[in-house]
Every structure is written in C-alpha cells, then in structure tokens.
Interface confidence: medium
Amino acid sequence: AEEQLEGGLRTAKDGPAAAKAAVRFHLRTSKGPEREGCYLSVGHSQPLEDCSFNMTAKTFFIIHGWTMSGMLENWLHKLVSALQMREKDANVVVVDWLPLAHQLYTDAVNSTRVVGLSVAKMLDWLQGKDGFSLGNVHLIGYSLGAHVAGFAGNFVKGTVGRITGLDPAGPMFEGVDIHRRLSPDDADFVDVLHTYTRSFGISIGIQMPVGHIDIYPNGGDFQPGCGLNDVLGSIAYGTIAEVVKCEHERAVHLFVDSLVNQDKPSFAFQCTDSNRFKKGICLSCRKNRCNGIGYNAKKTRNKRNTKMYLKTRAGMPFRVYHYQMKIHFFSYKSVGAIEPTFYVTLYGTNAESQVLSLEIVEQIGLNATNTFLVYTEEDLGDLLKIKLTWEGTSRSWYDLWREFRSYLSQPHRPERELSIRRIRVKSGETQRRLTFCVEDPEKTSIAPGQELWFYKCRDGWRMKNETSPTVEL
C-alpha cells in the first residue's frame, strides 16, 4: 500500500516521513481528560501505560478535516466530551494532522492518503497488543477527515469495526472511484451523515452515497437554524462562510446529540430521494427501512449505499416526530389546476402541535389520495384529532366575478371546493397507523378560508367495509 501511496502523491516531500512528523495521536481517557501530554507513538508502549489505555475497551479515533485557522476547532472538544460521557471506559484518540490540514484545501486533500496510512500504522501496532481488537475501533472523521478514515480503513491489516463519516468533503472526491475516497469497503460498518450537499455553487459535502447507510438530514442541504439571519442575527455580517460552516458542521452536532440525548434518539427513513421523502412516502421501518442516526445507527444486513432521510430541529436535541398524512381530495366539478395552501394542527394526549403547513411537493391530485409529510418538535402523545385549514388566498376581481357567475348558475356549491372524508396518519417514530374521520359525514366540504375537524375513528387504516387496500371511500 505504501508504494501505491507514494505513486499517488504529488511530491516526495509529502511522503510518509513528512506525515510521521505532522500527525500526532492525542489520547484522551476519561480517567484523565486533563492530562494533555498523552501522545501515542508507534513502537512506544510507555504512554499506553502512563495514560491508562484500556486494551479491551472501545477505541475512538476522531479525525478533523481541512482548517484555515490552524487550530483544533470547538466541535472537536465537544465530541471528545460526549464520547467520554457515553462510553466511560473507552479510549478516545484525537488524530491531529494540523500541519498538513492547515494548507490550501487542494494540498490538504493530497495529504489525506498519507495521514490515513499513519492512522493505519498506529492501528497495526496496537493490534500487536494483548486484548486490542480492530473490531472495537470506531473511526470518526469530519469533512476531509472522513476520507482520511477511509484511507486508514483501506490500508490497515484487517477490518476496522466502524467508520462514521461526518459530512465527508465533496471537492476532489465527488464521483471518484472507491479507492480514492471513503467507501463501504473501508470498515465492517460505514455510516455517513450528509449535511451540506448543494447542487449549485460548489458542494462542500459529498453528495453521493459513500457508506453502508448514508443519512441526509433535511434532505442534506438546507439545515434549519443555518440561514443567513439565523447564523448572526443580522444580514449585514451574515456571510456565506458562516452558513457553510453551520451546515457542514451540523453533521458533527447531530452525532454529538446522538451521544448525549440518548432518551431522544432521532430516526432516519430509507428513501430513494429527498423529494419522495418530502412527500411523506418513506416512513416505513419494515425490512430495516429505518435506523437510528449518529452513534445510534445500527449495522444492518442491507447491501450498501442505502440513502436515508429525516427532518430535524434547528438545535439540540434535534429529534422531531414524523407523520405521514394521506388525504383523498374529492372534487365534484372541474376546478382546473388549483394550488391550495393547507395547514393542519395535530392534537394529542400530551400536547397540540403548532400550525403545520402541508408541503405540496408537486401538485395536488384531485380525486386521488395525496401523501404529505408533517413533523412536530414536541411529543404530542397519542393523536386525538386534527384541524385542517384551507388558507384563503387573495382573489382578483376577475376571480370573484367568475365565482359569482358560477354561483348564479349553480348556487349550491362554490367553484373552489373540495371534499375530504378522512385523514389517515402514520407515525414514523411509533409506526402506528390511525384514521381520522369528519365528525359529520354530511359535512365534508372545505373551501378557501374554511376549516374541517377530524376525530380519531379507528386504529389502523382499513375501514370495516373496505374489501381491499386500494378502495377509497
């Protein structure tokens, strides 16, 4: 692998000897987190004893990415603390490759293989120690560090237990073959969080799936709380750089959240793409179709490159509660292409939700069942009832005149009116299905500016007189 590696480097000065001096392994054990002098070095066993390295425990390697500041950033210290809190006996090793990372981004990229080789050599040496198992090793790499972890997993003798890629870097890695980036072959389990994947400009995070499971919170692009206004509170100094940092680094904070908020785990759902997820189609947990995120992600028997999605809050704890809503809109006359704005409020045994918008991803299908995704920040408990509101839109005089003429010719029904008999709801987190019916079966119509109430009428989705799942009453 080393010969292969040398061939891939731009210049000889970037080779393994240079990397040896530029890569340091800082051991942070829970027993002595304040001991700053615990640096591991291949061939030197004394620091392992001095710093209470636990050979049989889990060992985490945290690998930072490219840096313009030349310093270890704040997220790293938070991640170290969170790991130590969650896994009290574990060894936490910070891979400090700042001298090589504090370069032009492209030059830092060219150093990732050699840094990965350094990590692999450290692991190979540790494997010679009694009780140490590569299966207990978990490499956690952020941005460029995710690819360093991939190279380490590729070069090590044996198979690392797990690699977590926290928004692996995109530029110079997007679309390249598996030996030149993080890939599922690099560990027994490779899970990835993608938080900055953009289709315009330059995507700082890699867009393509690179692990066994690839999780795209909020579609992997716009992270709540990271808009220009959110980042600094004022547009004047809210720069794109701050937005980039916020969204790119969100992957780290989601991982930290999964460590510290064990009682509020977030779940992601398998889906072919972000648009289908936004439609609420993908909230199934059958056949390993849902999984915890971050530290709580479980290795599944699925093949590789499983794309998963979830929504999150703007800050910790990030967990939200996902609901799929199925609504059949009946239309008794041709109303043309309408783009109604619907809102729902969910009422549960614990709380009621805020007013939630039903996002229309494509177009409302009339005389068809439409699926929506809604999510709440609070745990509502068992759902009891739903209020559906059709927002009244401002109308032109021409629209009003047309509606008035229509009323004269057919006074019993306004032109823009839909009928809804029930709403079917599925909770992503509990997988419970519920059906909500209108209180009065005679009063099912709704027009702009009006609301309809639906009450829980059964557990499950099939009504007594339904003979097949495809029949819509």
Partner: antibody, heavy 119, light 107 residues
Amino acid sequence: QVQLQQSGAELVKPGASVRLSCKASGYTFTKYTIHWVKQRSGQGLEWIGWFYPGSDSIKYNEKFKDKATLTADKSSRTVYMELSRLTSEDSAVYFCARHEEYTNSLAYWGQGTLVTVSA
Amino acid sequence: DIQMTQTTSSLSASLGDRVTISCRASQDISNYLNWYQQQPDGTVKLLIYYTSRLHSGVPSRFSGSGSGTDYSLTISNLEQEDIATYFCQQGYTLPWTFGGGTNLEIK
C-alpha cells in the same frame, strides 16, 4: 458589500522599500484570506502570497519569499505588503484580493496600487 | 509550478458573436480553474470559478467548461461591455498561476 480599498500610487528609488495597504470592509475580516497579485505593465498576473488574519498564517510564492513581507492590523482591518530592495523589475501594479474557501478563487479585488521604481 | 497557457493572446470579434477563449494547464488541475475579466481601466472581476460555476452578479451569457488540463470560457452573445482581457487561473496547488491573458477587441 465586500470592498478592498488599496493605498495610492508610489514612486520609489531603487534599493528602497515600500509598504502597500489593503483595507477590507463589508465582511468578517478574520474569516477570509487576503492574497496579493503582481501585474507588470501590459503583462499577465503573478501570485505573490496570502495572509490569513484568523491565525496570522502566511504563504509565499517561493519567487517572492525574499521580496515581500505580509502583515496585518486586525483593529483597522488592513493587510499590508512590504516590498524590499526594490529594482525596476518591481515596477508594477499590485492587487490585493479575497480568497473564497474551497473554490480557490479570488472573488473580490482591490483597485490596484501602481509602484514605480525609478532613480 | 503548474504552467497555464492561453494560446490566443488577442482575439477580434463582432458584437453578438459567440466567443470561446481556451486555457491549458501543464497537468491535471481537477476543475480548480477560474476565469477573471480585467477591464480597460484595470478593474479585475471574477467571472467563473471551479470550471463552470458563475460568480454572483455575472451575466448568464458567460459560461465555462472543461476538465483535466483543457478549459474554456464562452461568451454566447458578445456585448460592448465585454471588451476586456480575460485571464484563467489554477487554484489546484500553490503557487497559484495565471494564464498570459486573452485580449478581446471589437472587429
């Protein structure tokens, strides 16, 4: 909006030194690298080096390592370039420009400072 | 150092023409290629970054393409204000290097 305001033209004698300034406004000064670029009359552009105010990190083009010295004053949001032991070869327009991370491009440029070295 | 070559140092075209300016790198630069416009008064502006991404405020008649070592800038419908000198620059590795420039003038 982002602006880089450069100091005025300089006429200097051979062997002397000159200090050019580039004052930044409209963004968080410590978050972006400032680069310096040289353009001799009617010729192309040459990259001199960068200064990153966030950590006082400096990188030079080997060719200019003994010619240019980059410094900054964070309080006035200004980056300086001192050119020493001037010769007629140093007569040129010098631009400062702001680096865009990841894309390695120079998105915003100063108006340039003309340095003329003449006895 | 990576050499950047703009083979055409001067180019004449008519208003409304489609103009293409090319740039070649001495080695693969992985799409880290940027285009700049220097106006007659000396003002320098970024047009295209990372081979094909349009910088904010740049008219859509400008476009970029290429990969590996060969890159080009296209102006689809030449306007009077486009009369300037165009430089390519590689941001792949230090030192950053620029092409010699292509001076665009009206026929």
